[in-house]
């Protein structure tokens, strides 16, 4: 629980508690913003980002965005609040422990995004269908 000597200041979004009343500590995420990438046609890739940051707010999760156009491939790694859209998309998989890439519709490019909530989980980005719970066969296995 929040110790009594730690002030709960007014309008403070920095002190977040979980269901047990414990203070929610922030995520550690890869945070290199946008970098050129060689990740292409692979089941999974490492971010090759050497910067691990303490997310500024405890509610933030790790995010990775993979983009490919006619000129290059980039990988973006950041912390972001899942209550807010990122690149105009909701972070629907924010509670996942793994960063499972899902394709999003963006004109003129191939655009994949994932979010996750375990330490440095955006270091390993997964494209493989075997991890993707939108795969009907996998759903069948899960619910059997």
């Amino acid at each position: 629980t929040i110790p009594p000597h730690v002030q709960k200041s007014v309008n403070n979004d920095m002190i977040v508690t979980d269901n047990n009343g414990a203070v929610k500590f922030p995520q550690l995420c890869k945070f290199c913003d946008v970098r050129f990438s060689t990740c292409d046609n692979q089941k999974s890739c490492m971010s090759n980002c050497s910067i691990t940051s303490i997310c500024e707010k405890p509610q933030e999760v790790c995010v990775a965005v993979w983009r490919k156009n006619d000129e290059n491939i980039t990988l973006e790694t950041v912390c972001h609040d899942p209550k807010l859209p990122y690149h105009d998309f909701i972070l629907e998989d924010a509670a996942s422990p793994k960063c499972i890439m899902k394709e999003k519709k963006k004109p003129g490019e191939t655009f994949f995004m994932c979010s996750c909530s375990s330490d440095e989980c955006n270091d390993n980005i997964i494209f493989s269908e075997e991890y993707n719970t939108s795969n009907p066969d996998l759903l069948l296995v899960i619910f059997q």
């Epitope: 047990n20 414990a22 203070v23 500590f25 550690l28 691990t52 303490i54």
Partner: nanobody
Framework: EVQLLESGGGLVQPGGSLRLTCAAS???????RMWWVRQAPGKGLEWVS?????????YYADSVKGRFTISRDNSKNTLYLQMNSLRAEDTAVYYC?????????WGQGTLVTVSS
């Protein structure tokens, strides 16, 4: 009983240095990631730095990168924060904290005041 006792705070001029110490007892120190967290007057918590159980990996908030260094001596159950190039905005109560999935433990804090 888990105890965390911070020391080393005080009044320092801008550009100066301080070393904070956190003495831990009542738990297996080598099991836990440890944190330094600060709270400026009337403000929220700011997560300053963290260190993994064996001290191999360290993490910093952007606001202190390159100025603060976290370390630990597992043989002495002690956590440290070396603070250099201190600024007025570093003025806060500094807490050491430990955390696992269910519980968090906090020290009473030590006040750092950076002022000329």
């Amino acid at each position: 009983e888990v105890q965390l006792l911070e020391s080393g705070g005080g009044l320092v001029q801008p550009g100066g240095s301080l070393r904070l110490t956190c003495a831990a007892s009542g738990f297996t120190f080598t099991d836990d990631r440890m944190w330094w967290v600060r709270q400026a007057p009337g403000k929220g918590l700011e997560w300053v730095s963290a260190i993994d159980p064996q001290g191999q990996h360290t993490y910093y908030a952007d606001s202190v990168k390159g100025r603060f260094t976290i370390s630990r001596d597992n043989s002495k159950n002690t956590l440290y924060l070396q603070m250099n190039s201190l600024r007025a905005e570093d003025t806060a109560v500094y807490y050491c904290a430990k955390h696992n999935s269910s519980f968090d433990y906090w020290g009473q804090g030590t006040l750092v005041t950076v002022s000329s």
